[in-house]
C-alpha cells in the first residue's frame, strides 16, 4: 500500500541499525572518492531526518521520494565537480534521470588501493573501542570498492565480521583464530561481489525478463517439488528484489527481501522441505541461508519431458496461446530435473528449444521438425562437461597455481591486447574454480564450474568495456550473457596479435620482492608470465614452463643469499638472456 | 487468447465444391504452420491438409489430393481450404489447428456432401 512517507515507512521496517547500514551503503556505492567521515554524517543526517518523519509523517519534505532526498544530499556535497568530475552534471537533473545518472558513473573498477586488513591487536583495539564505527568502515570500504554489491547480503557479512572479532578479540591468540576466518569471509564475500554484478547485468544489458528466466531456472533446481506457479511467484519476487538493488533501491530491496523470506518460511509445505534450519535464524542469517539452501529431494515420478514439449500434439498450440508461458514451463520441468546442470546451460538449451519451436511451428509438419530437440540438445550438455572434466583433471595435476597459470597463458594468447594485471587478475579468478569447484561430489561440478567462470567472465568483459582494446573480447562479450563462457572457451590465439618487444626490464626484479606475502610473489611471477606470452604468444608449453622453472630458482637463490641486493643486480641479467635465448 | 473461428461449411451435392475460412486472432499468425482436420460422426479426427507459415510449402493427405487445396492470408490472418469434387465421404466437420494438432479447439464448420 502507499505510503504518506516512504523514508518512515522504511526506517519503520528495517529499525534504525539496518537503515543507517543501508544507507551508508548506497552513499558508499554512489560516491566512491567519499571518506568515511563524510558519509557517516550524511547518513546521521538522513536519519535524523527519517526519525523526525517517523515522529509526524506530515513534517516537511517527508513525503519526497528516497530517490529525491538521497540524491539531494548526495548533490550537497562541497566539492563535488572537483572530485567527481562529470558526475556532478547528474545534479542538474530532475528525478529519474539524476539516479539513472549516478548509476551509469558507478565504477567497477575505482583507484582505490587494495582494502587492507590492520593487524590482529590493532583491529581488536579499535573494535573494542567502537564497534559500530568500526563496522561502518567495513561496510564503506566493501561497498566502494563493489558499487553493486547485494547490500542485504552485505549486512549479513559485516555480521559475520563481528561476530568473528567478538569471539577472537577475546582469544589469547588473536591472530592465528582471525586470519584464517576472516579470509574466509572476504572470500565468499568476493564470489558474492562478482555473482551479484552478473545479476546486475543481466537486468541492465537484458531486461527482467532474463533475469526472471535465471531465476526460474535456478529456484526450480533447487525447489524441485514446488508447482510452477510457487516457481513463478519466487521468481517474480526475486526479480523485484535484485532489481532494486541494482537500481540503488536499497532500503526498498532490503525490505522486500525480509519479506520474502517471511513468505518461504510461511509457505514451506508448497515449497521444500529443506528450509526449516534456514527459517529459524534471525533475519540477515535467514535470508542469506535461503539464497544458497540445498537442493530439495526431486519428486520420483516425474514423466519424460518429451511428454510434454515433444510428444503432445498442442505444442505448437500451446506455444502460439502464450510463449512466455510454455517456455517458463519448459525451462521449469527441465531445470527441475537437472540439478546437476548449470543455470547457463539450462537457459542455452531453453533458448534452442525456443527457436526450435520458433522455426518448426512455422512449418507445415511441425512435429516431424521438432521430433529431434531433445537429441540435438546433446552437443550443448556435452561440451560444458568436457570443459569441467578438462580443467579439473588440470587442476588435480598442477594445483591452484599452477591452474592458474595455465589459465592464463591461455587467456593472454587469447586476448593479448588486455592489460597485463586485468588478465593476471582474470586468471586468478578463474583459477580459483579448481579450489572451489573440483572437489565437490560429481553432481555439483557443472552447476559449480560453469556459473562460477559465467560470472568472474562478466567482471572481464566489464573491465574490457571501458577501454575496449581486443576484438576476440568485444565479440564474446557482445553476446548474449549465456553463450559468454563458451565463447571465451572457443577463443584461440590472436592471429592478429603483433607480438610485444621484448624489454628488459619487465624482466628485472629486486630484493624488495623476497618480503612481499605469498600471494603478492605470485602475482609478480604471474605478471612476469603473461608479458613473455605477448612477447612470444606462440611460445610453447613447454618453452614457458623452462623459463617459470628458471625464474622460480632464480628468486629461491637470490632470496636465500646473504647478499641479496648483489645475487639480483648479477644473476638477473643473466636469467633475462637466458629467457630470450629459450624463448628464441 | 487464441481464437480460431471457421466457416463456408454447408450443404453440397456430390462434384460441388465449398471454400473454408478460418479466421485466426490472438497469435502471430504468420508465424505458425496451420492444418485443416475433420471428424466423421463416430469417427476419430481425421488430418486433412496443412500450410506453412509463409504459405509455400503444403501438404494433403493422400484421399483429398488433387480435390482440395490450402491457402492462408496473412495480412488478413485467414486460412482457406477450396474443396472441389467433393464426395459423400468428405462429410465432417472441418476445423484449423495450429502446427502440427489434431485436436480440435474451436466449433468447426459442418460439411455434408449430399443428393
Known amino acids: 500500500e502507499a505510503h504518506k512517507s516512504e523514508i518512515a515507512h522504511r526506517y519503520n521496517d528495517l529499525g534504525e541499525q539496518h537503515f543507517k547500514g543501508l544507507v551508508l551503503i548506497a552513499f558508499s556505492q554512489y560516491l566512491q572518492k567519499c571518506s568515511y567521515d563524510e558519509h557517516a554524517k550524511l547518513v546521521q543526517e538522513v536519519t535524523d531526518f527519517a526519525k523526525t518523519c517517523v515522529a509526524d509523517e506530515s513534517a516537511a519534505n517527508c513525503d519526497k521520494s528516497l530517490h529525491t532526498l538521497f540524491g539531494d544530499k548526495l548533490c550537497a556535497i562541497p566539492n563535488l565537480r572537483e572530485n567527481y568530475g562529470e558526475l556532478a552534471d547528474c545534479c542538474t537533473k530532475q528525478e529519474p534521470e539524476r539516479n539513472e545518472c549516478f548509476l551509469q558513473h558507478k565504477d567497477d573498477n575505482p583507484s582505490l588501493p587494495p582494502f587492507e586488513r590492520p593487524e590482529a591487536e590493532a583491529m581488536c583495539t579499535s573494535f573494542k573501542e567502537n564497534p559500530t564505527t568500526f563496522m561502518g568502515h567495513y561496510l564503506h570500504e566493501v561497498a566502494r570498492r563493489h558499487p553493486y554489491f547485494y547490500a542485504p547480503e552485505l549486512l549479513y557479512y559485516a555480521e559475520q565480521y563481528n561476530e568473528i572479532l567478538t569471539q577472537c578479540c577475546a582469544e589469547a591468540d588473536k591472530e592465528s583464530c582471525l586470519t584464517p576466518k576472516l579470509d574466509g569471509v572476504k572470500e565468499k564475500a568476493l564470489v558474492s561481489s562478482v555473482r551479484q554484478r552478473m545479476k546486475c547485468s543481466s537486468m541492465q544489458k537484458f531486461g527482467e525478463r532474463a533475469f526472471k528466466a535465471w531465476a526460474v531456472a535456478r529456484l526450480s533446481q533447487t525447489f524441485p517439488n514446488a508447482d510452477f506457479a510457487e516457481i513463478t511467484k519466487l521468481a517474480t519476487d526475486l526479480t523485484k528484489v535484485n532489481k532494486e538493488c541494482c537500481h540503488g533501491d536499497l532500503l526498498e530491496c532490503a525490505d522486500d527481501r525480509a519479506e520474502l523470506a517471511k513468505y518461504m518460511c510461511e509457505n514451506q509445505a508448497t515449497i521444500s522441505s529443506k528450509l526449516q534450519t534456514c527459517c529459524d535464524k534471525p533475519l540477515l542469517k535467514k535470508a542469506h541461508c535461503l539464497s544458497e539452501v540445498e537442493h530439495d529431494t526431486m519428486p520420483a515420478d516425474l514423466p519424460a519431458i518429451a511428454a510434454d514439449f515433444v510428444e503432445d500434439q498442442e505444442v505448437c498450440k500451446n506455444y502460439a496461446e502464450a510463449k512466455d508461458v510454455f517456455l517458463g514451463t519448459f525451462l521449469y520441468e527441465y531445470s527441475r530435473r537437472h540439478p546437476d546442470y548449470s543455470v547457463s546451460l539450462l537457459l542455452r538449451l531453453a533458448k534452442k528449444y525456443e527457436a526450435t519451436l520458433e522455426k518448426c511451428c512455422a512449418e507445415a509438419n511441425p512435429p516431424a521438425c521438432y521430433g529431434t530437440v531433445l537429441a540435438e540438445f546433446q552437443p550443448l550438455v556435452e561440451e560444458p562437461k568436457n570443459l569441467v572434466k578438462t580443467n579439473c583433471d588440470l587442476y588435480e595435476k598442477l594445483g591452484e597455481y599452477g591452474f592458474q597459470n595455465a589459465i592464463l597463458v591461455r587467456y593472454t594468447q587469447k586476448a593479448p591486447q588486455v592489460s597485463t594485471p586485468t588478465l593476471v587478475e582474470a586468471a586468478r579468478n578463474l583459477g580459483r574454480v579448481g579450489t572451489k569447484c573440483c572437489t565437490l561430489p560429481e553432481d555439483q561440478r557443472l552447476p559449480c564450474v560453469e556459473d562460477y567462470l559465467s560470472a568472474i567472465l562478466n567482471r572481464v568483459c566489464l573491465l574490457h568495456e571501458k577501454t575496449p582494446v581486443s576484438e576476440h573480447v568485444t565479440k564474446c562479450c557482445s553476446g548474449s550473457l549465456v553463450e559468454r563462457r563458451p565463447c571465451f572457451s572457443a577463443l584461440t590465439v590472436d592471429e592478429t596479435y603483433v607480438p610485444k618487444e621484448f624489454k628488459a626490464e619487465t624482466f628485472t626484479f629486486h630484493s624488495d620482492i623476497c618480503t612481499l606475502p605469498e600471494k603478492e610473489k605470485q602475482i609478480k611471477k604471474q605478471t612476469a608470465l603473461a608479458e613473455l606470452v605477448k612477447h612470444k604468444p606462440k611460445a610453447t608449453a613447454e618453452q614457458l614452463k623452462t623459463v617459470m622453472d628458471d625464474f622460480a630458482q632464480f628468486l629461491d637463490t637470490c632470496c636465500k643469499a646473504a647478499d641479496k641486493d648483489t645475487c639480483f643486480s648479477t644473476e638477473g641479467p643473466n636469467l633475462v638472456t637466458r629467457c630470450k635465448d629459450a624463448l628464441a | 487468447q487464441v481464437q480460431l473461428v471457421e466457416s463456408g461449411g454447408g450443404l453440397v451435392q456430390p462434384g460441388g465444391s465449398l471454400r473454408l475460412s478460418c479466421a485466426a486472432s490472438g497469435f502471430t499468425f504468420g508465424s505458425f504452420g496451420m492444418s485443416w482436420v475433420r471428424q466423421a460422426p463416430g469417427k476419430g479426427p481425421e488430418w486433412v491438409s496443412a500450410i506453412d507459415g509463409g504459405g509455400a510449402d503444403t501438404r494433403y493427405a493422400e484421399s483429398v489430393k488433387g480435390r482440395f487445396t490450402i491457402s492462408r492470408d496473412n495480412a488478413k490472418k485467414t486460412l482457406y481450404l477450396q474443396m472441389n469434387s467433393l464426395k459423400p465421404e468428405d462429410t465432417a466437420v472441418y476445423y484449423c489447428?495450429?502446427?502440427?494438432?489434431?485436436?480440435?479447439g474451436s466449433q468447426g464448420t459442418q460439411v455434408t456432401v449430399s443428393s
Open positions: 489447428t495450429i502446427g502440427g494438432s489434431t485436436s480440435r
